[in-house]
Interface confidence: medium
């Protein structure tokens, strides 16, 4: 037989299929010009010493073969003895290691079999009603195709699926979308309506992320509040490595997971902007406020579930940075100004109450006064900090209040609201004899003592009702007892106690009269 012809003789090897897993597959035959034809196939397994034979059976029942040697592609003309206008059945037999391996058969009319391309170029992937939609431009001059897909996950083998017939300039396919694992897809096409036409090669892999992006495994740490009233948020991040199918490993566009950081500033609720989203790589500086921090993972299908952490407020207090003056018209606070044109947020809440009860006020942008101070005033009618109780005050500052990451803490301190001088007056003052010339004076702690740093000192006043002489004794704010000595027996005294703050003198308690009994010796 001539090499250019199909040889109508028995092939030069025994006729027996070994049934092994390796062997020839994916046989495709098509017309490549007006009178030339090509068949190509894949061979799976060791290729050394393998000889391939393209077998062909005509409709009459006569069969022939082409010897292809070690090649997996063979061309022939319409004069090679194979009928091109009628249906023929073709398959490949590979002779290797004293055994024959056969490919599946294809039955087709060669003249009408056109070489179809797989989807070429950009395959667009989108989500549609919980399924995956793939779309691509139909290859030139190839409108009208059947399309199949195959897909696999990192832990499952290829599964075949059908996209149905296509008859347009763009083709599309609906495929299953996995919730939590990445998938690799490949597509192939063949001529529509042509009896037994060959499938194209499989397309390049299309890598598709899971519908739900993986949650990042992250930990946050927050540095101490600096002199500038800001603290660095740092991230210990181990983003979940998405397991990828074999064809998607390495560079797999489409499966990328991006992480965003969403900050929610819980303090100062009266500010304009409470949340801001940042690139995870841009770790921000925060004020000393309380925050919720969420890490949002997202892929091409959009954001996934949040993972949220709470960053508590920095409770370090500045005992003297805030001056408060109480006048007849109201109250004014003074503190060292940060810079020109700063907006301040003054936040207060009763001590011991839920953080959700914080109240705040936003100032208009203000410059420092001549003494370098910033101020905030409120009238008694406003009701701000009007109750006679302890308040925790925090002042935040920003040159750009709409940019969440630009707030800083100016100070945190405690303040006793309402008429503090009267409310702080010590009660239950009692006098007990201590010795022949001294007494012990005790009193119940002032309400001001519930407010850290507010009570500066107690002052105990003793008045000699005979001589009208008065002595005053300062007492540490942590003490509620003092010994008055150098007293004279039989003389009437009155004692009073007051509680002073740094900015306010307290109101004296009710006078308590006492005298030391004259000791009569026997």
């Amino acid at each position: 037989c001539r090499t250019s012809e199909c040889c109508f003789q028995d092939p030069p090897y025994p006729d027996a299929d070994s049934g092994s897993a390796s062997g020839p597959r994916d046989l495709r035959c098509y017309r490549i010009s007006s009178d030339r034809y090509e068949c190509s196939w894949q061979y799976e397994g060791p290729t050394a010493g393998v000889s391939h034979f393209l077998r062909c059976c005509l409709s009459s029942g006569r069969c022939c073969y082409f010897a292809a040697g070690s090649a997996t592609r063979l061309q022939f003309s319409d004069q090679a003895g194979v009928s091109v206008l009628y249906t023929v059945t073709l398959w490949v037999e590979s002779w290797a290691r004293n055994q024959t391996e056969k490919s599946p058969e294809v039955t087709l009319q060669l003249y009408n079999s056109v070489k179809y391309e797989p989807p070429l170029g950009d395959i667009k992937v989108s989500k549609l009603a919980g399924q995956l939609r793939m779309e691509w431009e139909t290859p030139d001059n190839q409108v009208g195709a059947e399309v199949q897909f195959r897909h696999r996950t990192p832990s499952s083998p290829w599964k075949l699926g059908d996209c149905g017939p296509q008859d347009d300039d763009t083709e599309s396919c609906l495929c299953p979308l996995e919730m939590n694992v990445a998938q690799e897809f490949q597509l192939r096409r063949r001529q529509l309506g042509s009896q037994g036409s060959s499938w194209s090669k499989w397309s390049s892999p299309v890598c598709v992320p899971p519908e739900n992006p993986p949650q990042p495994q992250v930990r946050f740490s927050v540095e101490q509040l600096g002199q500038d009233g800001r603290r660095r948020l740092t991230l210990k991040e181990q983003p979940t490595q998405l397991e990828l199918p074999e064809g998607c490993q390495g560079l797999a566009p489409g499966t990328e997971v991006t992480y965003r950081l969403q900050l929610h500033m819980l303090s100062c609720p009266c500010k304009a902007k409470a949340t801001r989203t940042l690139h995870l790589g841009k770790m921000p500086y925060l004020s000393g406020a309380a925050y919720n921090v969420a890490v949002i993972s997202s892929n091409q299908f959009g954001p996934g579930l949040n993972q949220t952490w709470h960053i508590p407020a920095d409770t370090h207090t500045e005992p003297v940075a805030l001056n408060i003056s109480v006048g007849t018209n109201g109250t004014t606070m003074y503190w060292p100004a940060r810079a020109q044109s700063m907006t301040y947020c003054i936040e207060w809440q009763p001590v011991g109450q839920d953080g959700g009860l914080a109240t705040c006020s936003l100032t208009a942008p203000q410059d420092p006064d001549p003494a370098g101070m910033a101020t905030y005033s409120w009238s008694r009618e406003s009701g701000a900090m009007g109750q006679e109780k302890c308040y925790y005050i925090t002042i935040f500052a920003s040159a750009h209040p709409e940019k969440l990451t630009l707030w800083s803490t100016v100070l945190s301190t405690y303040h006793f609201g309402g008429n503090a001088s009267a409310a702080g007056t010590p009660h239950h003052v009692s006098v007990k004899n201590h010795s022949l010339d001294s007494v012990s004076v005790d009193w119940a702690p002032s309400l001001l003592s519930t407010c850290p740093g507010v009570l500066k000192e107690y002052v105990v006043r003793c008045r000699d009702e005979d001589s009208k002489q008065v002595s005053e004794h300062p007492v540490q704010p942590t003490e509620t007892q003092v010994t008055l000595s150098g007293l004279r027996a039989g003389v009437a005294y009155t004692v009073q106690v007051r509680a002073d703050t740094a900015w306010l003198r307290g109101v004296w308690s009710q006078p308590q009269r006492f005298s030391i009994e004259v000791q009569v010796s026997d």
């Epitope: 667009k124 965003r260 949340t275 989203t277 690139h279 997202s298 954001p303």
Partner: antibody
Amino acid sequence: QVQLVESGGGVVQPGRSLRLSCAASGFTFTSYGMSWVRQAPGKGLEWVAGISYSGSDTEYADSVKGRFTISRDNSKNTLYLQMNSLRAEDTAVYYCARSPDYIIDYGFDYWGRGTLVTVSS
Amino acid sequence: AIQMTQSPSSLSASVGDRVTITCRASQGISSDLAWYQQKPGKAPKLLIYDASSLQSGVPSRFSGSGSGTDFTLTISSLQPEDFATYYCQQYWIYPFTFGQGTKVEIK
């Protein structure tokens, strides 16, 4: 591929209103912040307004605050700019631009071709 | 609002030249700066974001640097398709603002 197509421009008298639309395709619209940027004839670029991915946050340039409203319909993949009380100085090509993030705090990675708004009596 | 000042306003250069455009912010903007290229009758195109990150698909002859208030766009070897107007833009604070533009013309 990503496509942004503006429409709704035209000639309008001062004081009147106009609504611009921007149809987005080729990407997951609900995952991106969007903005409007304008360019007066022969002049530079001016950012007009921006909106976050969900529509919850909006921002405006001082020159349009109180007159223009940016909004989005995520079900229609469409961005809008409602322009009221138009002035001659609002005459410009208006571009729709995508932010490469959920919010609008970054540059703009995709732009439409623009639609011309002429405010003239 | 933050003022963005570009210099020069225009420049003439030849193919193969190294071109540098600067942008100065009226206050610190960290690295929240983008550079765009615009050709007549076309929409702007993002070249650089975060002051120095090259946008995907942009040739590596474009580079950006700077932080705070002073920023630079460099074209290492000018190509015929690079003749255009270039804008910087800050996105540190609202309202976002652009520079007035630098026109790069053929010498």
